[in-house]
């Protein structure tokens, strides 16, 4: 596969991953009420996210409440907010860096410098994925630990929410996409013939038979 194809595929994966990360960040489903026993008579499900918590009644009516005080939030929610927002912003920066280093753009002149810019974009996406992975795994660890902790009240036990799974899928896409961008940039630096167009030499004068020398054509 040519470096341009790697670049395009990598960028598409990164953009989808970025969208997924934004979705995960905003969804109030980082943890959801766990129904362990049928004898808990409850008519509602609680969802908790980074920015709000929602109560879903059995009737389908949903009521969400945005967290009032930042200081009142637990450490992991504050850290998760900072890291996921940081990852989203880093992906935004990575997008411009990647576009600048892309073969189809003229922001940077073709050559090793352009390949290095593209490589930087790929690395930034990889970092973005790692950055987003930290709060997702930290949060998941707390939810799982408390689920199995016998000291935690039954009604206060939660399960992993959809936002965490979306987040993990997004980080996977960001890291795979970033890896492909890095591979594409690496191909450019190590095999320039695979990346930039061949510079054709001017055709020689016609031979006696009137044919052009075909070796100039690929």
């Amino acid at each position: 596969m040519g470096s341009a194809a790697l670049e395009i595929l990598g960028l598409v994966l990164c953009l989808v991953g970025w969208g997924g990360l934004i979705l995960a960040c905003g969804l109030p489903m980082w943890q959801v009420t766990a129904f362990l026993d049928h004898n808990i008579v409850t008519a509602q499900t609680t969802w908790k996210g980074l920015w709000m918590s929602c109560v879903v009644q059995s009737t389908g009516h949903m009521q969400c409440k945005v967290y009032d005080s930042v200081l009142a939030l637990s450490t992991e929610v504050q850290a998760a907010r900072a890291l996921t927002v940081g990852a989203v912003l880093l992906a935004f920066v990575a997008l411009f860096v990647t576009l600048a280093g892309a073969q189809c753009t003229t922001c940077v002149a073709p050559g090793p410098a352009k390949a290095r810019v593209a490589l930087t974009g790929g690395v930034l996406y990889l970092l973005c994925g790692l950055l987003a992975l930290v709060p997702l795994c930290w949060f998941a660890n707390i939810v799982v630990r408390e689920f199995y902790d016998p000291s935690v009240p039954v009604s206060q036990k939660y399960e992993l929410g959809a936002a965490l799974y979306i987040g993990w899928a997004a980080t996977a896409l960001l890291m795979v996409g970033g890896g492909l961008l890095c591979c594409g940039a690496w191909v450019c630096t190590s095999r320039p013939d695979l990346s930039f167009p061949v510079k054709y030499s001017a055709p020689r004068r016609p031979t006696a038979t009137g044919d052009y020398d075909k070796k100039n054509y690929v």
Epitope: L36, P150, S151, P153, S155
Partner: antibody, heavy 117, light 112 residues
Framework: EVQLVESGGGLVQPGRSLKLSCAAS????????MAWVRQAPKKGLEWVAS????????YYGDSVKGRFTISRDNAKSTLYLQMKSLRSEDTATYYC??????????WGQGVMVTVSS | DIVMTQSPSSLAVSAGETVTMNCRSS????????????LAWYQQKPGQSPKLLIS???TRESGVPDRFIGSGSGTDFTLTINNMQAEDLAIYYC?????????FGAGTKLEL
Amino acid sequence: EVQLVESGGGLVQPGRSLKLSCAASGFTFSDYYMAWVRQAPKKGLEWVASISYEGRNTYYGDSVKGRFTISRDNAKSTLYLQMKSLRSEDTATYYCTRHPRRYFDYWGQGVMVTVSS
Amino acid sequence: DIVMTQSPSSLAVSAGETVTMNCRSSQSLFSSGDQKKFLAWYQQKPGQSPKLLISLASTRESGVPDRFIGSGSGTDFTLTINNMQAEDLAIYYCQQHYDIPYTFGAGTKLEL
């Protein structure tokens, strides 16, 4: 030997505040949920509040929700109960308890809080 | 909230006899997840703090004499004291440790 020693009780007027403390020893404080349980004179036991290991999660009984705040200082192995807007019905002996597996396995000697004008 | 109802409220006893007291919960305290019954029994002697005797319906705490026996189903529980001793005179409370708010029964008082 597990020891829980409460302090800070006394006579207080309705509407005023009081802060109870509980000094713990004989076990690794940060390894346990802790709780406050109270007992009104000649009455039964009532769970007041619980707090998780590092204080991340707190739970309250309906009668004290919004008025009482449970907290802990693991460095000092001390449990606290900040009581605000006290009412006559808050008059009770307050027990500091160790709280594993949602039951109360060790209890302090208790501290009396009297809310009266 | 889970309501705990204890009976009888008081009981006249004699040394050496077998004493039985009951505790009923308004909903099942049995967890299908870990196959446990979340009920505890406490003993409170006059002028003293409560003392945990039994947790998980039947598990005796260390140091508790084996004459104290806890049993029961999901909603109906029993504390039996075999060979009643004078030092066992106290108020006995049951508590559901299934979920918040944790609730206690009103107590059963043992009197001579």
